[in-house]
């Protein structure tokens, strides 16, 4: 039995932060998980994680120097990343691992969210004429 | 899926009973398997649970020390043992198997019941 | 550990009656709640999991309800076969502690 997962297709960051709602097809209040959220095409780079169990607070941290920070809905982590970088545009892919209680579980693999990271555009301001002079 | 349970047990005062719980009908190293108490005129008590995949073991405290849940993987069994044996231990004991249903549990399928009396 | 009180313990009603038995649980369990029914000398059956969800080949005149620490079995029209012993059970965590039971008897 595998776990199904839903994502956007494509996130824009806009501010260099964004909001990916990972949606599962399973309740996570009873249970003790992991979900985690991963960069690239072969998943190679581990962004965030989520730790829960229903009896403890939620633990959320990056490895990989990451900003990121964790909510939870009872069939759903959503992954909130800041400070991104041009350069970090790419596929991103949500997984969950049900750890207790047995059996474990986990997911199918998704179809992964391209987040488009678009760079600060600074606006010029506007041209003010100097003091006038007599 | 089954759940056949051992048959009814007659025991004095201080003795031990173990009690079966053979399934079928499904992949015995999958599912949870929780134990339940049914005193008579009472309601039912849990006592808790064996998960035969990795031999994970949840017991209610109030029956540590009183039973012991095992399993035999080959003849996909699992097994109650019950231990220095009181009147108060008399009741029927339900074996039953916990399904999880998208992340809610449940007990969908329970054996007949082993009746176990405890008499002087 | 979580407590479960379940009311009432017992009670009589008539064919075709609307009766409801209720589950308040100490803590919130988010839904991790089932009912089952029990006849004398039989096993107990599932009626509702994940509070209120109704079991396949389980009639419609039963359902659940509630959320938090509030929850409640109705049988919205009862039938001669429906009496018995009802128990609501939760699993947010362990013991998974069941209610008291309720006895119900048909006038």
């Known amino acids: 039995n595998k776990i199904l997962v839903k994502q956007s297709p494509m996130l824009v960051a806009y501010d260099n932060a964004v909001n990916l709602s990972c949606k599962y097809s399973y309740n996570l209040f009873s249970r003790e998980f992991r979900a985690s959220l991963h960069k690239g095409l072969d998943s190679a780079v581990e962004v965030c994680v989520v730790y829960g169990n229903y009896s403890q607070q939620l633990q959320v941290y990056s490895k990989t120097g990451f900003n990121c920070d964790g909510k939870l809905g009872n069939e759903s982590v959503t992954f909130y990343l800041q400070n991104l970088y041009v350069n970090q545009t790419d596929i991103y892919f949500c997984k969950i691992e049900v750890m207790y209680p047995p059996p474990y579980l986990d997911n199918e693999k998704s179809n992964g969210t391209i987040i488009h990271v678009k760079g600060k555009h600074l606006c010029p301001s506007p041209l003010f004429p100097g003091p006038s002079k007599p | 899926v089954q759940l056949q349970q051992s048959g009814a047990e007659l025991k004095k005062p201080g003795a031990s009973v173990k009690v079966s719980c053979k399934a079928s009908?499904?992949?015995?190293?999958?599912?949870?398997i929780h134990w339940i108490k049914l005193r008579s005129g009472q309601g039912l008590e849990w006592i808790g649970w064996?998960?035969?995949?990795?031999?994970?073991?949840q017991y209610n405290a109030q029956f540590k020390g009183k039973a012991t849940l095992t399993a035999d993987k080959s003849s996909s069994t699992v097994y109650m043992e019950l231990t220095g044996l009181t009147p108060e231990d008399s009741a029927v004991y339900f074996c039953?198997?916990?399904?999880?249903?998208?992340?809610?549990?449940?007990?969908?399928?329970w054996g007949q019941g082993t009746l176990v009396t405890v008499s002087a | 550990d979580i407590q479960m009180t379940q009311s009432p313990s017992s009670l009589s009603a008539s064919v075709g009656d609307r009766v409801t038995i209720t589950c308040k649980t100490n803590?919130?369990?988010?839904?991790?709640l089932a009912w089952y029914q029990q006849k004398d000398g039989k096993s107990p059956q599932l009626l509702i999991y994940?509070?209120?969800h109704l079991v396949e080949g389980v009639p419609s005149r039963f359902s659940g309800s509630g959320s938090g620490t509030q929850y409640s079995l109705t049988i919205s029209s009862l039938q001669p076969e429906d009496f018995g012993n009802y128990y609501c059970?939760?699993?947010?965590?362990?013991?998974?502690?069941f209610g008291g039971g309720t006895k119900l008897e048909i006038k």
């Open positions: 039953a198997r916990r399904d999880d249903f998208s992340g809610y549990d449940a007990l969908p399928y």
């Open positions: 009908g499904y992949t015995f190293t999958e599912y949870i």
């Open positions: 064996f998960y035969p995949g990795s031999n994970d073991i």
């Open positions: 803590e919130n369990i988010y839904s991790n």
């Open positions: 994940a509070a209120t």
């Open positions: 059970q939760h699993f947010w965590g362990t013991p998974a502690t």
